[in-house]
């Protein structure tokens, strides 16, 4: 039985040109995390393998950095980065847990007047 839950940063906003950390945390399970995949819509951004480390997609090499921890840092944000991001935890023996984060990238002037979304 899958007992775990994923806590995420939820809905977040960031300024165009800036960077943002996407974070997920798996709790309430003793399952072993074997790999975490980070995805945006239908694109695989990065993989963190528990034994082997990080690999970043060659198409995002310039704008994605691993960490902190199992999180992911997106850099040089553009408005096109707005959308859903998923952290997919592959665990043994539970199986797969998925967390969702919605990122809105705002024009600088909008961001200065306060983000529409708050990190819970």
């Amino acid at each position: 039985m899958m007992t775990g839950t994923i806590e995420t940063t939820g809905n977040i906003s960031a300024e165009k040109g800036g960077s943002i950390i996407l974070q997920c945390h798996l709790s309430s399970t003793t399952a072993q995390v074997t790999q975490v995949n980070w995805e945006q819509q239908d694109q695989l951004l990065a993989i963190c393998n528990a034994d082997l480390g990080w690999h970043i997609s060659p198409s995002f090499k310039d704008r994605v950095a691993p960490g902190p921890g199992l999180g992911l840092t997106l850099q040089s944000l553009t408005v096109n980065d707005t959308g859903e991001y998923f952290c997919i935890y592959h665990t043994y023996p539970d199986g797969t847990y998925t967390g969702r984060i919605f990122l809105e990238v705002l024009e600088s002037s909008v961001a200065e007047h306060g983000a529409r979304f708050q990190i819970p």
Epitope: Q35, Q41, D42, Q43, L44, H55, P58, S59, K61
Partner: antibody
Framework: EVKLVESGGALVQPGGSLKLSCAAS????????MYWVRQTPEKRLEWVAS????????YYPDTLKGRFTISRDNAKNTLYLQMSRLKSEDTDMYYC????????????WGQGTSVTVSS | DIVMTQSHKFMSTSVGDRVTITCKAS??????VAWYQQKPGQSPKLLIY???ARHTGVPDRFTGSGSGTDFTLTISNVQSEDLADYFC?????????FGVGTKLELK
């Protein structure tokens, strides 16, 4: 069992067009990135194109951009490669391949389909 | 573009021997390197990914190692069915690039 079966290879004249297909079975096609890779008669391997799971993004080497187009139909479990303005140097064996779920690497390849560009 | 150099186009070996195939990247690719085996008339088959991880079903006589720019594929206790072409590939950066291959043949 993962199975990838390419088709559509043919003898075509320089300047002509050709569309290759790759029928996938034995896995959930829409969950995987897919690739086309070609191999010259001298056995040199060259990456041709990549496509994301839903087909929203495609990638090509600069040398092939504009002439080749990768696409997919997830309802039909089929990958395509549209090739235009073909040149003699496009004469190759064309393979489709699946990206691994563990890494950005091609874990299963089809048997290939042969393309010959000659007048 | 990242050039993957396999300096030995041919390597001779005997059944039971240990052989090491090398591959050098023109720039740092971390551990984003795969090794493929291709037998005559067949398509390439993945052996190693992440520089050292064995693909499902690959015998443990195949071992990959290296990081940065220098990579090796070692086959210990070579079997006759291992006689094939071996290609390295980097997937750290686009365009994805392959080595020219090393043909493993009997002495």
């Amino acid at each position: 069992e993962v199975k990838l079966v390419e088709s559509g290879g043919a003898l075509v004249q320089p300047g002509g067009s050709l569309k290759l297909s790759c029928a996938a079975s034995g896995f959930t096609f829409s969950d995987y990135y897919m690739y086309w890779v070609r191999q010259t008669p001298e056995k040199r391997l060259e990456w041709v194109a990549s496509i994301t799971k839903g087909g929203g993004s495609t990638y090509y080497p600069d040398t092939l951009k504009g002439r080749f187009t990768i696409s997919r139909d997830n309802a039909k479990n089929t990958l395509y490669l549209q090739m235009s303005r073909l040149k003699s140097e496009d004469t190759d064996m064309y393979y489709c391949a699946r990206q691994s779920s563990y890494d950005f690497v091609m874990d299963y390849w089809g048997q290939g389909t042969s393309v010959t560009v000659s007048s | 573009d990242i050039v993957m150099t396999q300096s030995h186009k041919f390597m001779s070996t005997s059944v039971g021997d240990r052989v090491t195939i090398t591959c050098k990247a023109s720039q740092d690719v971390d551990t984003a390197v795969a090794w493929y085996q291709q037998k005559p008339g067949q398509s390439p088959k993945l052996l190693i990914y992440w520089a050292s991880a064995r693909h499902t079903g690959v015998p443990d006589r195949f071992t990959g190692s290296g990081s940065g720019t220098d990579f090796t594929l070692t086959i210990s206790n070579v079997q006759s069915e291992d006689l094939a072409d071996y290609f390295c590939q980097q997937y750290s950066n686009y365009p994805l690039t392959f080595g020219v291959g090393t043909k493993l043949e009997l002495k």
